[in-house]
């Protein structure tokens, strides 16, 4: 009679994470008598997966009834597969012995590969806001996928970006992998409504890539432009001066009026108007009693936007002449080292 052979017909098996893997194994003879055991890996460090004779293996079920005398099918199913289950599985026939069974013959092995979906990409931007015309870095991370092959793309408002670097780790063999990519994005004045998208394509996703997004509204700071103008006379001794604060983002803004360098009023932008591009406009006005001033008055509109150093614009109010419509004066004065008189 021909000697028993252990047949593992599948050289490799590919299973998606969470599914059940079937590892096939048949023997060509009933003799010698003895149990079958399944191992992952070979050599002294191999891991026992299933023992026909004894033990508790909750994730493993047999395909056929191993208690039947004439059974020669020793195939098993392993449930709820994870990337950690990847490896080469050996079906090994033992011969009954005393006191211990003796290994008789091993199958050629079946390599179990696990397909695991990448986690949802997480996109993060710079730690602080940046202004238009600057290039900032965004990172995208996704983890836990297998096999290693993966494609990552970056988009800004649907337009593909080319300036990025991507790494997949680890470099060598692993049960699962991670991807990390850094893209450089140029901010423009119109980016308040823009989005940066990281798109990950993998064999497990069946052509439906995963996307992570970042809103540039969380990254950009658009500094305001200031314009101070004098309005027509409201009453004989009163002049209305307005400070137009235009095209700023985010909304957080505090405005201070100074008369000859002395604080007259401070207010916080509340009832702003929103522009189509997502930036805001705001107007503040100051009623100046001209009769209270003997000399010309320097009115300064000082704005602190989003916690940045204050910027300001000044206007010289001529008291000596009869109050009339005046434009914004050129002379301006800083009142502190952290204040910038803009435009």
């Amino acid at each position: 009679e021909e000697e028993l052979q252990v047949i593992q017909p599948d050289k490799s098996v590919l299973v998606a994470a969470g599914e059940t893997a079937t590892l096939r194994c048949t023997a060509t003879s009933l003799i010698p008598v003895g149990p079958i055991q399944w191992f992952r890996g070979a050599g002294p460090g191999r891991e026992l997966i299933y023992n026909q004779k004894e033990g508790h293996f909750p994730r493993v079920t047999t395909v056929s009834d191993l208690t039947k005398r004439n059974n020669m099918d020793f195939s098993i199913r392993i449930g709820n597969i994870t990337p950690a289950d990847a490896g080469t599985y050996y079906c090994v026939k033992f011969r009954k012995g005393s006191p211990d069974d003796v290994e008789f013959k091993s199958g050629a092995g079946t390599e179990l590969s696990v397909r695991a979906k990448p986690s949802a990409p997480v996109v993060s931007g710079p730690a602080a806001r940046a202004t238009p015309q600057h290039t900032v870095s965004f990172t995208c991370e996704s983890h836990g996928f297998s096999p290693r092959d993966i494609t990552l793309k970056w988009f800004k408002n649907g337009n593909e970006l080319s300036d990025f670097q991507t790494n997949v780790d680890p470099v060598g063999e692993s049960v699962s992998y991670s991807i990390h990519s850094t893209a450089k994005v140029v901010l423009t004045r119109e980016d308040v409504h823009s989005q940066v998208i990281c798109e990950v394509a993998h064999v497990t996703l069946q052509g439906d890539p995963l996307r992570g997004t970042a809103n540039l509204s969380e990254t950009i700071r658009v500094p305001p432009t200031l314009e101070v103008t004098q309005q027509p006379v409201r009453a004989e001794n009163q002049v209305n001066v307005t400070c137009q604060v235009r095209k700023f983002y985010p909304q957080r803004l505090q405005l201070t009026w100074l008369e000859n360098g002395n604080v007259s009023r401070t207010e916080t932008a509340s009832t702003v108007t929103e522009n189509k591009d997502g930036t805001y406009n705001w107007m503040s006005w100051l009623l100046v009693n001209v009769s209270a001033h003997r000399d010309d008055v320097k009115l300064t509109c000082q704005v602190e936007h989003d916690g940045q150093p204050a910027v300001s614009k000044s206007h010289d109010l001529k008291v000596s002449a009869h109050p009339k419509e005046q434009g914004s004066n050129t002379a301006a004065e800083n009142t502190g080292s952290n204040e910038r008189n803009i435009y």
């Epitope: 602080a128 940046a130 202004t131 015309q133 900032v136 658009v222 940045q308 301006a332 080292s337």
Partner: antibody, heavy 119, light 107 residues
Framework: QVQLVQSGAEVKKPGASVKVSCKAS????????IHWVRQAPGQGLEWMGD????????ANNQKFKGRVTMTRDTSTSTVYMELSSLRSEDTAVYYC????????????WGQGTLVTVSS | DIQMTQSPSSLSASVGDRVTITCKAS??????VAWYQQKPGKAPKLLIY???SLETGVPSRFSGSGSGTDFTFTISSLQPEDIATYYC?????????FGGGTKVEIK
């Protein structure tokens, strides 16, 4: 008071790189941009780029085609400008200067660093 | 890139004279113009920004005006200490660009 202190003069061979530092003090480092401007002997001023220490955002003069790298170390309030693939025409005084983020007029300047490129 | 054409490239004037330097931008830069003074062997010094705003501590004899593409820098009464080279700079669109400079000398 506001100060920008730059590293000392450098002599480099063509093809080499130079890294100039600019240490800021007297103000909140992350609130202002640091710009780099160079001036060749007897020539005018040329803007190279800037970095915002808070966000790490940079703007570059494309004339330098990726030869300029600007980095910052917030722990030491220092900005670095590295210029690679040096050629003789890169011989110049390199200045760092401070500007309010988004407004770009440079109100405080470093003392300048002379970089000489010669074989 | 936006070109800043500065003129004249040099001028000679007497103490007390009114000195005017012009800068023309190749496209509209609104009012995003600064003027700097540079003395030999020294770093530039900001005098004017936002076309017309005077930097802290800068004497009032220095002034600026203009908008759009045409800008003017004026020294109302030239002083001996004003001998220097003056540069305009636009900061509307990157790369920020400077004019070629105007060397001011005293007769």
């Amino acid at each position: 008071q506001v100060q920008l202190v730059q590293s000392g003069a450098e002599v480099k061979k063509p093809g080499a790189s130079v890294k100039v530092s600019c240490k800021a003090s007297g103000y909140t480092f992350t609130d202002y941009e640091i710009h780099w401007v160079r001036q060749a002997p007897g020539q005018g001023l040329e803007w190279m780029g800037d970095i915002h220490p808070g966000s790490g955002g940079t703007a570059n003069n494309q004339k330098f085609k990726g030869r300029v790298t600007m980095t910052r170390d917030t722990s030491t309030s220092t900005v670095y400008m590295e210029l690679s693939s040096l050629r003789s025409e890169d011989t110049a005084v390199y200045y760092c200067a401070r500007a309010v983020s988004g407004y770009y007029a440079m109100d405080y300047w470093g003392q300048g660093t002379l970089v000489t490129v010669s074989s | 890139d936006i070109q800043m054409t500065q003129s004249p490239s040099s001028l000679s004037a007497s103490v007390g004279d009114r000195v005017t330097i012009t800068c023309k931008a190749s496209e509209d830069i609104y009012d995003r113009v600064a003027w700097y003074q540079q003395k030999p062997g020294k770093a530039p010094k900001l005098l004017i920004y936002g076309t017309a705003s005077l930097e802290t501590g800068v004497p009032s004899r220095f002034s600026g005006s203009g908008s759009g593409t045409d800008f003017t820098f004026t020294i109302s009464s030239l002083q001996p200490e004003d001998i220097a080279t003056y540069y305009c700079q636009q900061y509307w669109t990157t790369p920020w660009t400077f004019g070629g400079g105007t060397k001011v000398e005293i007769k």
